[in-house]
């Protein structure tokens, strides 16, 4: 008589029984391992920096203007400075350098601190240009804006950028820009390869 509920005949060799007894914990272990592995992978994905996922992004605030004869604006970024950050791109002497090829949204706003509508027109031309300034072989203007009657300009555009491109923001004219973080800022966002 077979033992009740054993599922194994006493007279037969218990291969099926042994196999079943071994397979059940093995399958259970594999399932648990799979669940744990998926959870850990998901956590690892969440903890990965944005740049490793391809989402290179930077938002910068004005640090200072250049010395005489240097029209460039010098930028700074980082959590300690407030609402500015760099994930992927980096700053090289206050200029933004791209680390990943792709199409980027480039945006900028600049407000002049010493300015009125009459000043802006009187001190014409005051212009802001954003461009690739190095390497020299890729040098090109990406954005050009003029302060005609106002004290603030803002613009954005999509443009392809390559690893190693350094973006420069040139402010020409005699009007001092504001360093207020809600008035003057510059950033890029990777959109697609």
């Amino acid at each position: 008589m077979p033992e009740e509920g054993s599922g194994c005949s006493v007279r037969r060799r218990p291969y099926g029984c042994v196999l079943r007894a071994a397979l059940v914990p093995l399958v259970a272990g594999l399932v648990i391992c799979l669940v744990v592995c998926i959870q850990r992978f998901a956590q690892a994905q969440q903890q990965l920096p944005l740049e490793s996922l391809g989402w290179d992004v930077a938002e910068l605030q004005l640090n200072h203007t250049g010395p005489q004869q240097d029209p460039r604006l010098y930028w700074q970024g980082g959590p300690a400075l407030g609402r500015s950050f760099l994930h992927g791109p980096e700053l090289d002497k206050g200029q933004l350098r791209i680390h990943r090829d792709g199409i980027y949204m480039v945006h900028i706003q600049v407000t002049l601190a010493i300015c009125s509508s009459t000043t802006a027109s009187r001190h014409h031309p005051t212009t802001l240009a954003v461009g690739i300034c190095s390497p020299a072989s890729r040098s090109i203007s990406l954005l050009r804006l003029s302060f005609h009657q106002g004290c603030t300009i803002a613009s954005q555009r999509l443009t392809p950028l390559a690893r190693g491109d350094t973006l420069c923001t040139n402010l020409t004219g005699t009007l001092l820009p504001s360093r207020n973080t809600d008035e003057t800022f510059f950033g890029v966002q990777w959109v697609r390869p």
């Epitope: 200072h64 203007t65 250049g66 010395p67 005489q68 240097d70 601190a113 010493i114 300015c115 009125s116 509508s117 009459t118 000043t119 001190h123 004290c151 005699t174 009007l175 001092l176 820009p177 504001s178 360093r179 207020n180």
Partner: antibody, heavy 120, light 109 residues
Framework: EVQLVESGGGLVKPGGSLRLSCAAS????????MNWVRQAPGKGLEWVSL????????YYADSVKGRFTVSRDNAKKSLYLLLNSLRAEDTAVYYC?????????????WGQGTLVTVSS | EIVLTQSPATLSLSPGERATLSCRAS???????LAWYQQKPGQPPRLLIF???SRATGIPDRFSGSGSGTDFTLTISRLEPEDFAVYYC??????????FGGGTKVEIK
Amino acid sequence: EVQLVESGGGLVKPGGSLRLSCAASGFTFSSYSMNWVRQAPGKGLEWVSLISSSSRFIYYADSVKGRFTVSRDNAKKSLYLLLNSLRAEDTAVYYCARGDYSNYPYFDYWGQGTLVTVSS
Amino acid sequence: EIVLTQSPATLSLSPGERATLSCRASQSVRSSYLAWYQQKPGQPPRLLIFGASSRATGIPDRFSGSGSGTDFTLTISRLEPEDFAVYYCQQYGDSPALTFGGGTKVEIK
């Protein structure tokens, strides 16, 4: 503690020259625009000049344009004002004043001032 | 050049009273970019208010600024003995002429 100390004032004849200095301490001098503001005896305040942190942007009041020259040495944390072709109406206490970090030209810290007297 | 006119030239009040000082610009001052300073005899000016209504660091809340366009006001809600001084408004919305008003003297009645 932010400190601004002016020096170089004194008695000078009309047409003469003088160089004022302002020694700064207690803050990152190279990050701030700096200004000169003057006050004639018993009168109100008159802004004279502004120089940006990197010296790229320099502004003067019309009354001193072409006669006064502002400069700074960030390494020495010093601000200067060279006064040429002095007139009797330039007689005043000259204050060195720090501009706001935002670059907006209002003056959050002032020195005690140095007196310039132009008289024959 | 923007001209700032302060009124009254002199304000005679007692401690505990409210002081209202006016500053009028000859043309609109950009986005309320106007400052107020206090000056006591033999001392340099002290920044009280910037951006027309923002109190500078360490300034007591009895000082308040308001206004926009061409009309601005400095209010001292309850005068303390140390508040008797000369007050100047300054505009910094135009360049290169950053101008001060002629001042209002707040004296003890």
